[in-house]
Amino acid sequence: QGWQAFKNDATEIIPELGEYPEPPPELENNKTMNRAENGGRPPHHPFETKDVSEYSCRELHFTRYVTDGPCRSAKPVTELVCSGQCGPARLLPNAIGRGKWWRPSGPDFRCIPDRYRAQRVQLLCPGGEAPRARKVRLVASCKCKRLTRFHNQSELKDFGTEAARPQKGRKPRPRARSAKANQAELENAY
């Protein structure tokens, strides 16, 4: 998901204990709400909800090292990966637990990054070079976004990489920069 955007071809993905992509065991308990931060209120009737805030999606915690060429972060960073189909908050935990997904018949709902956070990492390099400082952008929470047939595929493609793309633009969270600028950022070792 998001971490691919860092040009860290050698990025190591280390799922935290109990945080594997498979549904956590506790989700099998009918009374347990999904851990998604933005789970929202349970709908009055699961199939009639129109409000995106009433949908929920999973936030999976992954631990990874940030790498840049031969250099690697001293400590791993933990970030969220927004995962899975969105469904009504009340149904989602049960449906996952039983291995069934609720699928909306009308508009599509996708689980995408909502909020972000910055974190400084120290990159340790071989050969006795001083540690480099680097800041990375990590997903802090996920949300369900309602997609209609008017949303094209390129927008869907963006969801995965928006999490990790370094940002600089004029707006709080612009979707993208020019390809040239992004490429330049990746080519410059930090």
Partner: antibody
């Protein structure tokens, strides 16, 4: 539009403390580190340190460790810098600057706060 | 600390001239460098990030380049409004460090 609005000029006596503020607007405050920079009269710029508003984690330039303290108030999107034990060497303009990850730190600056230390 | 040695400390040029100034890093193999312009009484303004990328809204007469640990800011055709002091900043190693500045005057 991203804006960083700093508090007004300060005239303080040697040995005293000063706390200057930087009010952020136009973006999600916790998404970006906030740095503080010192510029003595007619001189270059010195990085004092920065703070991660999301976690409160601070990193200081060794030169300013022990005299400068960086804090934030997340609820009001304000970053603060307090300088203690002021001397004439601390007379300067202090800037806050938003750090835009590795792409371009310091793309946005406050207007600066002039601190004058005088008996 | 990584020292950024900026030269010249001041220079005078005529309108339309090509102007160059440099910053040299005292150490470090992977310096990420920005260039700033500062006019009297104002906060610095970002011109170039990542050594060579032009910040949004900055005129294309400004450009940046690097050769190893040497970094150059070039103004291809000097204009009146370019009268200012220019600083470089390295932000790959802690603490971040600025160059001493180059004061640009118009002849």
């Amino acid at each position: 539009e991203v804006q960083l609005q700093q508090s007004g000029p300060e005239l303080v006596t040697p040995g005293a403390s000063v706390k200057i503020s930087c009010k952020a607007s136009g973006y999600t405050f916790t998404d970006h580190y906030m740095s503080w920079v010192k510029q003595s009269h007619g001189k270059s710029l010195e990085w004092i340190g920065d703070i991660n508003p999301y976690s409160g984690e601070t990193t200081y330039n060794q030169k300013f460790k022990g005299t400068a303290t960086l804090t934030v108030d997340k609820s009001s999107s304000i970053a603060y810098m307090e300088i203690r034990g002021l001397t004439s060497e601390d007379s300067a303009v202090y800037y806050c600057a938003r750090d835009d990850y590795d792409a371009s730190p310091f793309a946005y600056w406050g207007q600066g706060t002039l601190v004058t230390v005088s008996a | 600390d990584v020292q950024m040695i900026q030269s010249p400390s001041s220079l005078s040029a005529s309108l339309g001239d090509i102007v160059t100034m440099t910053c040299q890093a005292s150490q470090g193999t992977s310096i990420n460098l920005n260039w700033f312009q500062q006019k009297p009484g104002k906060a610095p303004k970002l011109l170039i990030y990542g050594s060579s990328n032009l910040e949004d809204g900055v005129p294309s007469r400004f450009s940046g380049s690097r050769y190893g640990t040497d970094f150059t800011l070039t103004i291809s055709s000097l204009e009146d409004e370019d009268l200012a002091t220019y600083f470089c900043l390295q932000h790959s190693y802690l603490p971040y460090t600025f160059g001493g500045g180059t004061k640009l005057e118009i002849k």
